[in-house]
Interface confidence: low
Protein backbone atom coordinates (compact mmCIF):
# COMPACT_ATOMS: atom_id res chain seq x y z
CA UNK A 1 0.00 0.00 0.00
CA UNK A 2 1.50 3.32 -1.08
CA UNK A 3 1.64 6.17 1.42
CA UNK A 4 -0.67 8.97 0.37
CA UNK A 5 1.40 11.87 1.62
CA UNK A 6 4.99 13.00 1.96
CA UNK A 7 6.78 12.54 5.28
CA UNK A 8 6.34 15.59 7.55
CA UNK A 9 8.50 18.61 6.93
CA UNK A 10 10.62 19.76 9.86
CA UNK A 11 12.14 23.27 9.61
CA UNK A 12 15.87 23.15 8.93
CA UNK A 13 15.92 19.35 8.74
CA UNK A 14 16.13 16.76 6.03
CA UNK A 15 15.00 13.17 6.08
CA UNK A 16 16.41 9.99 4.64
CA UNK A 17 15.46 6.34 4.48
CA UNK A 18 18.19 3.96 5.61
CA UNK A 19 16.64 1.26 3.44
CA UNK A 20 13.51 0.97 1.35
CA UNK A 21 10.70 -1.48 1.98
CA UNK A 22 9.64 -3.83 -0.81
CA UNK A 23 7.09 -2.06 -2.95
CA UNK A 24 8.90 1.27 -2.83
CA UNK A 25 9.11 2.92 -6.23
CA UNK A 26 11.72 5.37 -7.47
CA UNK A 27 10.97 7.54 -10.49
CA UNK A 28 13.37 7.20 -13.41
CA UNK A 29 14.06 10.90 -13.78
CA UNK A 30 16.71 12.38 -16.03
CA UNK A 31 18.53 15.68 -15.73
CA UNK A 32 17.81 18.55 -18.08
CA UNK A 33 18.74 17.78 -21.66
CA UNK A 34 18.18 14.06 -21.18
CA UNK A 35 15.17 11.77 -21.24
CA UNK A 36 14.29 8.18 -20.52
CA UNK A 37 15.21 5.83 -23.35
CA UNK A 38 12.34 4.81 -25.58
CA UNK A 39 10.39 1.97 -23.98
CA UNK A 40 12.40 2.58 -20.83
CA UNK A 41 10.97 2.10 -17.40
CA UNK A 42 9.09 4.77 -15.52
CA UNK A 43 10.19 3.47 -12.15
CA UNK A 44 12.54 1.23 -10.27
CA UNK A 45 10.71 -1.06 -7.86
CA UNK A 46 12.08 -2.66 -4.70
CA UNK A 47 11.04 -6.27 -5.05
CA UNK A 48 12.16 -9.64 -3.84
CA UNK A 49 11.44 -12.74 -1.82
CA UNK A 50 11.95 -13.78 1.79
CA UNK A 51 15.72 -13.99 1.45
CA UNK A 52 16.71 -11.23 -0.94
CA UNK A 53 15.42 -7.84 -2.04
CA UNK A 54 16.68 -5.73 -4.92
CA UNK A 55 15.62 -3.00 -7.29
CA UNK A 56 13.91 -4.47 -10.32
CA UNK A 57 14.89 -2.68 -13.48
CA UNK A 58 17.47 -0.01 -14.21
CA UNK A 59 16.78 3.58 -15.13
CA UNK A 60 18.42 4.74 -18.33
CA UNK A 61 18.70 8.25 -19.74
CA UNK A 62 19.66 9.34 -23.20
CA UNK A 63 20.40 12.74 -24.66
CA UNK A 64 17.31 14.56 -25.83
CA UNK A 65 19.25 15.52 -28.96
CA UNK A 66 20.59 12.08 -29.86
CA UNK A 67 19.33 8.50 -29.57
CA UNK A 68 22.47 6.54 -28.84
CA UNK A 69 23.48 7.47 -25.28
CA UNK A 70 21.87 4.54 -23.50
CA UNK A 71 24.79 2.96 -21.69
CA UNK A 72 24.42 2.35 -17.96
CA UNK A 73 27.48 3.50 -16.04
CA UNK A 74 28.35 4.92 -12.66
CA UNK A 75 28.75 8.69 -12.81
CA UNK A 76 32.20 10.18 -12.55
CA UNK A 77 32.95 12.22 -9.41
CA UNK A 78 32.12 15.50 -11.09
CA UNK A 79 28.72 14.12 -12.12
CA UNK A 80 28.06 12.88 -8.62
CA UNK A 81 28.61 16.39 -7.26
CA UNK A 82 25.44 17.45 -9.01
CA UNK A 83 23.36 15.21 -6.76
CA UNK A 84 21.79 17.14 -3.90
CA UNK A 85 23.40 15.41 -0.95
CA UNK A 86 24.76 16.63 2.34
CA UNK A 87 27.76 14.62 3.49
CA UNK A 88 27.80 14.02 7.23
CA UNK A 89 30.68 12.59 9.21
CA UNK A 90 29.62 9.92 11.66
CA UNK A 91 31.73 8.02 14.18
CA UNK A 92 29.63 4.90 13.61
CA UNK A 93 28.60 3.12 10.46
CA UNK A 94 24.95 3.46 9.38
CA UNK A 95 22.66 0.45 9.32
CA UNK A 96 23.90 -2.38 7.16
CA UNK A 97 21.02 -2.14 4.75
CA UNK A 98 21.69 -5.56 3.31
CA UNK A 99 20.87 -7.08 6.70
CA UNK A 100 17.32 -5.77 6.74
CA UNK A 101 14.97 -8.42 5.35
CA UNK A 102 12.39 -7.11 2.92
CA UNK A 103 14.32 -3.91 2.25
CA UNK A 104 16.43 -2.59 -0.61
CA UNK A 105 19.57 -0.48 -0.38
CA UNK A 106 19.76 3.03 -1.78
CA UNK A 107 19.89 2.48 -5.55
CA UNK A 108 23.20 3.44 -7.14
CA UNK A 109 23.15 6.52 -9.34
CA UNK A 110 22.57 6.14 -13.06
CA UNK A 111 24.13 8.19 -15.81
CA UNK A 112 22.52 11.60 -16.28
CA UNK A 113 20.14 11.06 -13.38
CA UNK A 114 18.11 14.06 -12.23
CA UNK A 115 19.41 15.88 -9.17
CA UNK A 116 16.27 15.07 -7.17
CA UNK A 117 15.04 11.57 -6.44
CA UNK A 118 11.30 11.05 -6.19
CA UNK A 119 10.31 8.02 -4.14
CA UNK A 120 6.89 6.51 -3.64
CA UNK A 121 6.96 5.04 -0.15
CA UNK A 122 4.87 2.17 1.18
CA UNK A 123 3.21 1.55 4.54
CA UNK A 124 5.78 0.59 7.15
CA UNK A 125 8.53 2.75 5.70
CA UNK A 126 10.62 4.62 8.24
CA UNK A 127 12.56 7.79 7.49
CA UNK A 128 15.09 9.53 9.73
CA UNK A 129 15.52 13.24 10.27
CA UNK A 130 18.63 15.26 10.93
CA UNK A 131 19.23 18.97 11.26
CA UNK A 132 20.90 20.53 8.24
CA UNK A 133 24.37 22.03 8.51
CA UNK A 134 24.36 25.15 10.63
CA UNK A 135 21.53 23.92 12.85
CA UNK A 136 21.52 21.64 15.85
CA UNK A 137 18.94 19.38 17.46
CA UNK A 138 17.25 20.78 20.54
CA UNK A 139 14.66 18.11 21.10
CA UNK A 140 16.03 14.64 21.84
CA UNK A 141 12.90 12.63 21.08
CA UNK A 142 12.63 10.13 18.20
CA UNK A 143 13.91 11.81 15.04
CA UNK A 144 12.03 9.46 12.78
CA UNK A 145 8.68 9.10 11.07
CA UNK A 146 6.85 5.96 10.05
CA UNK A 147 4.13 5.62 7.42
CA UNK A 148 1.23 3.84 9.14
CA UNK A 149 -2.17 2.65 8.04
CA UNK A 150 -4.97 3.82 10.34
CA UNK A 151 -8.67 3.24 9.62
CA UNK A 152 -7.89 2.55 5.99
CA UNK A 153 -5.88 5.74 5.51
CA UNK A 154 -2.15 6.25 5.54
CA UNK A 155 -0.41 8.78 7.75
CA UNK A 156 3.14 9.60 8.82
CA UNK A 157 3.98 9.80 12.52
CA UNK A 158 5.34 13.14 13.70
CA UNK A 159 9.09 13.19 14.36
CA UNK A 160 10.14 14.78 17.65
CA UNK A 161 12.90 17.00 16.37
CA UNK A 162 13.52 20.72 16.67
CA UNK A 163 16.45 22.29 14.84
CA UNK A 164 17.82 25.61 15.97
CA UNK A 165 20.54 27.83 14.55
CA UNK A 166 24.04 27.64 16.06
CA UNK A 167 23.86 31.29 17.10
CA UNK A 168 20.70 30.80 19.13
CA UNK A 169 21.30 30.24 22.82
CA UNK A 170 18.12 28.49 23.96
CA UNK A 171 19.01 25.10 25.39
CA UNK A 172 17.45 22.44 27.54
CA UNK A 173 18.31 22.86 31.23
CA UNK A 174 21.73 21.41 31.94
CA UNK A 175 22.52 20.99 28.27
CA UNK A 176 25.90 22.31 27.27
CA UNK A 177 26.42 23.98 23.97
CA UNK A 178 28.09 21.29 21.88
CA UNK A 179 31.66 21.67 20.73
CA UNK A 180 32.29 21.93 17.04
CA UNK A 181 33.37 18.71 15.40
CA UNK A 182 36.65 18.57 13.42
CA UNK A 183 34.68 19.38 10.31
CA UNK A 184 33.23 22.45 11.94
CA UNK A 185 29.79 20.90 12.38
CA UNK A 186 27.86 20.80 15.64
CA UNK A 187 28.15 17.63 17.69
CA UNK A 188 24.41 17.06 17.71
CA UNK A 189 24.36 17.04 13.95
CA UNK A 190 27.04 14.44 13.54
CA UNK A 191 26.06 11.98 16.24
CA UNK A 192 22.32 12.06 16.72
CA UNK A 193 21.48 8.58 17.96
CA UNK A 194 18.04 7.22 17.12
CA UNK A 195 16.27 4.06 18.16
CA UNK A 196 14.41 2.35 15.35
CA UNK A 197 11.34 0.40 16.31
CA UNK A 198 10.96 -1.06 12.82
CA UNK A 199 14.36 -2.67 12.68
CA UNK A 200 14.81 -3.22 16.45
CA UNK A 201 18.31 -1.81 16.38
CA UNK A 202 20.05 1.39 17.32
CA UNK A 203 21.97 3.23 14.70
CA UNK A 204 23.55 6.48 13.78
CA UNK A 205 22.00 8.57 11.07
CA UNK A 206 23.14 7.62 7.61
CA UNK A 207 26.36 9.11 6.38
CA UNK A 208 24.64 10.58 3.35
CA UNK A 209 21.42 12.53 3.50
CA UNK A 210 19.36 13.76 0.58
CA UNK A 211 18.61 17.45 0.85
CA UNK A 212 15.96 17.17 -1.79
CA UNK A 213 12.34 16.54 -1.00
CA UNK A 214 11.03 13.03 -1.55
CA UNK A 215 7.53 13.18 -2.99
CA UNK A 216 4.89 10.51 -3.13
CA UNK A 217 2.86 11.80 -6.02
CA UNK A 218 1.53 8.72 -7.76
CA UNK A 219 0.36 8.86 -11.34
Amino acid sequence: ELCDDDPPEIPHATFKAMAYKEGTMLNCECKRGFRRIKSGSLYMLCTGNSSHSSWDNQCQCTSSATRNTTKQVTPQPEEQKERKTTEMQSPMQPVDQASLPGHCREPPPWENEATERIYHFVVGQMVYYQCVQGYRALHRGPAESVCKMTHGKTRWTQPQLICTGEMETSQFPGEEKPQASPEGRPESETSCLVTTTDFQIQTEMAATMETSIFTTEYQ
Epitope: R36, S39, G40, L42, T47
Partner: nanobody, 127 residues
Protein backbone atom coordinates in the same frame (compact mmCIF):
# COMPACT_ATOMS: atom_id res chain seq x y z
CA UNK B 1 12.90 -15.26 -13.54
CA UNK B 2 9.21 -15.45 -14.41
CA UNK B 3 7.55 -18.79 -15.11
CA UNK B 4 4.18 -18.81 -16.85
CA UNK B 5 1.56 -21.57 -17.06
CA UNK B 6 -1.60 -21.15 -19.11
CA UNK B 7 -4.91 -22.95 -18.58
CA UNK B 8 -8.55 -22.68 -19.57
CA UNK B 9 -8.34 -23.67 -23.23
CA UNK B 10 -10.68 -26.14 -24.80
CA UNK B 11 -13.28 -26.81 -27.46
CA UNK B 12 -16.16 -24.36 -27.75
CA UNK B 13 -18.84 -23.61 -30.31
CA UNK B 14 -18.83 -20.40 -32.30
CA UNK B 15 -20.42 -17.61 -30.30
CA UNK B 16 -19.35 -19.22 -27.04
CA UNK B 17 -16.98 -18.00 -24.37
CA UNK B 18 -13.78 -19.14 -22.68
CA UNK B 19 -11.63 -17.66 -19.98
CA UNK B 20 -7.92 -18.29 -20.20
CA UNK B 21 -5.74 -18.00 -17.11
CA UNK B 22 -2.02 -17.52 -16.81
CA UNK B 23 -0.37 -18.32 -13.50
CA UNK B 24 2.95 -16.59 -12.99
CA UNK B 25 5.67 -17.40 -10.50
CA UNK B 26 8.86 -15.49 -9.90
CA UNK B 27 9.67 -12.31 -8.07
CA UNK B 28 9.17 -9.81 -10.86
CA UNK B 29 5.69 -10.62 -12.17
CA UNK B 30 4.06 -7.48 -10.89
CA UNK B 31 6.65 -5.28 -12.58
CA UNK B 32 6.06 -6.68 -16.06
CA UNK B 33 3.60 -5.79 -18.76
CA UNK B 34 1.83 -9.02 -19.68
CA UNK B 35 0.50 -10.10 -23.04
CA UNK B 36 -1.47 -12.83 -24.76
CA UNK B 37 -0.39 -14.06 -28.17
CA UNK B 38 -1.76 -16.82 -30.37
CA UNK B 39 -0.55 -19.03 -33.16
CA UNK B 40 -3.03 -20.57 -35.58
CA UNK B 41 -2.01 -23.64 -37.62
CA UNK B 42 0.33 -22.63 -40.43
CA UNK B 43 0.39 -18.98 -39.35
CA UNK B 44 2.76 -16.64 -37.58
CA UNK B 45 2.35 -15.93 -33.91
CA UNK B 46 0.12 -12.87 -33.54
CA UNK B 47 -0.54 -10.39 -30.78
CA UNK B 48 -3.91 -10.61 -29.03
CA UNK B 49 -3.88 -8.31 -26.00
CA UNK B 50 -1.63 -6.80 -23.35
CA UNK B 51 -2.06 -5.24 -19.93
CA UNK B 52 0.41 -2.91 -18.25
CA UNK B 53 2.16 -3.78 -15.02
CA UNK B 54 0.09 -1.26 -13.07
CA UNK B 55 -3.14 -2.18 -14.93
CA UNK B 56 -3.45 1.41 -16.16
CA UNK B 57 -3.30 0.49 -19.84
CA UNK B 58 -4.67 -2.28 -22.02
CA UNK B 59 -4.01 -2.93 -25.67
CA UNK B 60 -5.95 -5.17 -28.04
CA UNK B 61 -5.52 -6.44 -31.56
CA UNK B 62 -8.17 -5.06 -33.89
CA UNK B 63 -9.51 -8.54 -34.59
CA UNK B 64 -10.45 -9.14 -30.94
CA UNK B 65 -11.36 -5.66 -29.73
CA UNK B 66 -14.77 -5.61 -28.15
CA UNK B 67 -14.84 -9.40 -27.78
CA UNK B 68 -11.79 -10.16 -25.63
CA UNK B 69 -10.88 -8.60 -22.29
CA UNK B 70 -7.49 -8.86 -20.64
CA UNK B 71 -7.07 -8.42 -16.91
CA UNK B 72 -4.61 -9.23 -14.18
CA UNK B 73 -4.53 -9.83 -10.45
CA UNK B 74 -1.14 -8.84 -9.07
CA UNK B 75 -2.04 -10.20 -5.67
CA UNK B 76 -2.56 -13.68 -7.09
CA UNK B 77 0.09 -13.38 -9.82
CA UNK B 78 -2.53 -14.12 -12.47
CA UNK B 79 -3.36 -12.80 -15.92
CA UNK B 80 -6.68 -13.54 -17.59
CA UNK B 81 -8.12 -13.39 -21.08
CA UNK B 82 -11.89 -13.42 -21.22
CA UNK B 83 -12.92 -14.42 -24.74
CA UNK B 84 -16.52 -13.83 -25.79
CA UNK B 85 -18.31 -14.21 -29.13
CA UNK B 86 -15.67 -16.65 -30.28
CA UNK B 87 -15.23 -17.29 -34.00
CA UNK B 88 -13.66 -20.25 -35.82
CA UNK B 89 -10.78 -17.96 -36.82
CA UNK B 90 -9.93 -17.59 -33.13
CA UNK B 91 -8.78 -21.22 -33.14
CA UNK B 92 -5.13 -21.25 -32.08
CA UNK B 93 -2.68 -22.05 -29.34
CA UNK B 94 -2.77 -19.13 -26.91
CA UNK B 95 0.40 -18.06 -25.13
CA UNK B 96 0.89 -15.88 -22.09
CA UNK B 97 4.02 -13.69 -22.17
CA UNK B 98 5.88 -11.26 -19.91
CA UNK B 99 7.52 -8.09 -21.22
CA UNK B 100 11.31 -8.06 -21.14
CA UNK B 101 11.52 -4.53 -19.71
CA UNK B 102 10.21 -4.27 -16.16
CA UNK B 103 7.96 -1.30 -15.38
CA UNK B 104 7.90 -0.36 -19.04
CA UNK B 105 5.95 2.72 -19.99
CA UNK B 106 5.14 1.30 -23.42
CA UNK B 107 2.58 -1.35 -24.34
CA UNK B 108 4.13 -3.37 -27.12
CA UNK B 109 2.43 -5.84 -29.44
CA UNK B 110 5.66 -7.34 -30.83
CA UNK B 111 6.49 -10.88 -29.73
CA UNK B 112 10.23 -10.14 -29.72
CA UNK B 113 9.67 -7.64 -26.90
CA UNK B 114 8.60 -10.44 -24.57
CA UNK B 115 11.22 -12.54 -22.80
CA UNK B 116 9.11 -15.00 -20.85
CA UNK B 117 6.60 -17.38 -22.40
CA UNK B 118 4.25 -20.10 -21.26
CA UNK B 119 3.80 -23.43 -23.02
CA UNK B 120 0.45 -22.41 -24.47
CA UNK B 121 -3.13 -23.66 -24.24
CA UNK B 122 -5.19 -24.87 -27.19
CA UNK B 123 -8.42 -23.08 -28.06
CA UNK B 124 -10.61 -24.65 -30.74
CA UNK B 125 -13.76 -22.93 -31.95
CA UNK B 126 -16.07 -25.11 -34.00
CA UNK B 127 -18.68 -23.80 -36.37
Amino acid sequence: QVQLVESGGGLVQAGGSLRLSCAASGGTFRTRNMGWFRRAPGKEREFVAAVSWNVDNKLYAGSVKGRFTISRDNGRNMVYLQMNSLKPEDTAVYYCAADNIPLSSDMRPTATEYDYWGQGTQVTVSS
